[in-house]
């Protein structure tokens, strides 16, 4: 039997656990979108705009391993590109499917709408190429299924965006249905045996000699699916384990060997000391960006650094291209306990102590709030922190085990998290309807992407939306222009947003004191994700987590350097 190419695409996506597709309709993709309704278990999210759709696809992929966004040629796809670039930067697998004009229209170089009027139909495809792992423009129905499979595999395996152009006239053509009976091969190609052996032997020798080793889990630990291996590595070796800001949520923070968040000079002193005095650092999935490293302020005393990456390994100054960390870790786990048996476990840095008791009328401040937040969180929560005070503040919160952390530390596109919350909420609902999705976003950031709350309401999704109202772009005020008009924003009536977007079953709260925070977060009904909630957190204008204040100084200095 045969099925249409459009249906083939959606069946393949369903096979790899992608059940929600993001994007907007446009005349070059409408026929494709018809097919989504023919595939049981698939849904079309229907976003408010393409940028938000890209952010949503990113959030969904961080939870489920990959995602798909569909846009239309030119006007639609270009609106998504900032979001797609963020997914590229941060190693997130998003398949970007673009409905393009028919092959005959392209061949005739017709001056169609949504074109630049110059007959060039490849220009937008070329724009996307630099922020995609691979691209495909389908031109031949015979090879189309294999191209779709290649694009899905590449998206998933490399954890990078992939661009797939589908001409409007091809999606209704038929392909053999039996192709769906063979799963797409998602396996990694094995490492070169000789290189892999050299890597493993070298690591084992370093482990054997180490007196003061540490494990540092970073962004690509979760993005490239080695969280389980890393947890086992900690269990087997008992080495102290730390995370970077981008690694937050990639290891269990209730583990007795968890030591805290390492951000170079911005770390707590005892964390800084523990990591920087180590004689061996096993760095899993490092992504050494400025905000992830305290403006490149790592100051290791040792040269014995092993970097585990998805597509290479680095030991001291030697790089081993093509040696993938997944296999290295799996093989290491069979022998590392023996190599580490001489290690005498040292104490890990103490947890941040609980907040001291203060009068209930004490005005809420960030330092107190982020520390207190850990009491509200539950195992399995998805915690999403917007660029700005939230992304820095969340580093002070100790997560329960199995918490998903989402923030965009490297790309840092303001407003990203509203869309990402939508995507994460879809993903969480598909995994477990009781799984909570909790957003922390500033009043300034929210103004860029607020429309996507409407999509959450449309689908009955129930995230917690904590809006930190500190009257403007606080992170930017701290970096430059504390009193500048360009860092000011129009104040909104945040608690009217949910009904404005048509919510019927919702809650709104305004919290300004420590007592109000505790009363709300300890309320049993508030702890169940039974409805969408907007919580406005009233904060002083220049209030910010201390690590952000320090980072802002470093960033300002970097920006001013000649």
């Amino acid at each position: 039997s045969e099925i249409t190419l459009g249906k083939y695409l959606f069946e393949r996506l369903k096979q790899v656990n992608v059940n929600t597709v993001f994007g907007l309709p446009g005349d070059f993709n409408l026929s494709l979108l018809d097919k989504i309704y023919e595939v049981e278990g698939m849904r079309w999210a229907g976003n408010a705009n393409e940028l938000n759709a890209a952010y949503a696809a990113d959030g969904y992929a961080r939870i489920k391993g990959m995602s798909c966004i569909i846009t239309t040629f030119g006007v639609g796809e270009l609106s998504a590109l900032n979001g797609i670039a963020g997914s590229y930067a941060e190693h997130v697998g998003v398949l970007h499917v673009v409905g393009v004009p028919s092959i005959s229209a392209q061949a005739k170089q017709l001056l169609l709408h949504h074109t630049l009027g110059n007959g060039d139909f490849t220009v937008f495809h070329r724009m996307s190429a630099n922020i995609s792992e691979t691209t495909a423009m389908i031109t031949d129905i015979a090879t189309a299924p294999a191209e779709i499979d290649r694009c899905i595999r590449t998206t998933y395996v490399t954890q990078r965006p992939v661009y797939l152009g589908l001409p409007a006239n091809l999606v209704d053509l038929n392909v053999p249905a039996k192709l769906l009976q063979t799963p797409i091969d998602m396996s990694l190609k094995p490492n070169d045996a000789e290189s892999e052996k050299e890597v493993i032997d070298t690591i084992l020798a370093l482990v054997k000699d180490a007196k003061n080793p540490v494990i540092l889990a970073d962004a690509c630990c979760s993005r490239h699916d080695v969280k389980a291996e890393t947890k086992k590595l900690i269990d087997l070796t008992q080495f102290p384990a730390f995370v970077t800001p981008m690694g937050k949520g990639s290891i269990d923070e209730q583990h007795p060997r968890y030591g805290g968040v390492y951000v170079g000079t911005l770390s707590k002193p005892e964390v800084k000391e523990a990591v920087e005095s180590a004689d061996l650092i096993l760095s899993v999935g490092a992504l050494l960006s400025d905000f992830n490293t305290g403006s490149f302020s790592y100051s290791y005393k040792t040269k014995n650094i092993v970097e585990f990456h998805s597509d290479h390994m680095k030991i001291r100054n030697a790089t081993f291209p093509g040696v993938q960390m997944k296999f290295v870790l799996q093989k290491l786990l069979t022998t590392i306990a023996d190599a580490a048996k001489g290690y005498k476990p040292v104490a890990v840095p103490a947890r941040t102590p609980a907040n001291a008791a203060v009068p209930a009328s004490t005005p809420l401040k960030q330092e107190w709030m982020w520390n207190q937040l850990g009491n509200f969180l539950q195992e399995g929560d998805v915690v999403i922190a917007e660029t700005g005070t939230s992304a820095f503040g969340i580093n002070q919160t100790t997560f329960p085990n199995n918490t998903y952390g989402i923030s965009q530390v490297l790309w840092g596109s303001i407003g990203f998290t509203t869309g990402a919350t939508l995507g994460a909420a879809f993903a969480a609902e598909e995994i477990d309807p009781k799984k909570r999705v909790i957003l922390f976003i500033g009043d300034g950031s929210l103004q860029l992407t607020v429309q996507e709350i409407s999509t959450m309401i449309r689908w009955g999704l129930k995230p917690y939306l904590f809006v930190l109202n500190n009257d403007g772009y606080t992170i930017e005020k701290l970096i430059h222009g504390p009193k500048a008009q360009y860092n000011e924003i129009q104040g909104w009536d945040h608690l009217s947003l949910l009904p404005t977007f048509g919510a019927k079953d919702y809650e709104t709260h305004r919290v300004a004191t420590t007592g109000e925070w505790d009363k709300l977060t300890q309320d049993k009904s508030f702890n169940d994700n039974s409805k969408i909630r907007m919580i406005e957190i009233m904060l002083p204008v220049f209030d910010a987590p201390q690590n952000l204040v320090e980072q802002a100084k470093l960033t300002a200095a970097t920006n001013a350097k000649q």
């Epitope: 069946e11 369903k14 096979q15 790899v16 656990n17 059940n19 049981e40 278990g41 391993g65 998933y156 799963p183 797409i184 091969d185 998602m186 396996s187 699916d225 389980a228 195992e379 399995g380 199995n402 598909e430 995994i431 477990d432």
Partner: nanobody
Amino acid sequence: QVQLVESGGGLVQAGASLTLSCAASGRTFNTYSMHWFRQAPGKEREFVAATNWGGNSKFYADSVRGRFTISRDNTKNMVYLQMNSLKPEDTAVYYCAAHRTVVGKTPDYWGQGTQVTVSS
């Protein structure tokens, strides 16, 4: 981490039916793709069937397609293999297996296996 325990194997006549069950421990069963493999005496272990997280995409080896059905119940952390029209060549140890992500990757976790013997 997930632990897998198979049950339901046994000795049956050719043409009969049998349902294998696999009980999985672990909070996040519904984020694992689930598989059945089998190994006949003196042969390599071979793929039989697999299903994605939601149980709404299923894959089968050509040798069992149309006779075997894989299903899962995420509320009970169970995966099943309904085997109809059994043949002597279906005799093997059947293994339940799980992968943390998608079908199409080598499973991370394996059960101990359950013996199925089909007599002619």
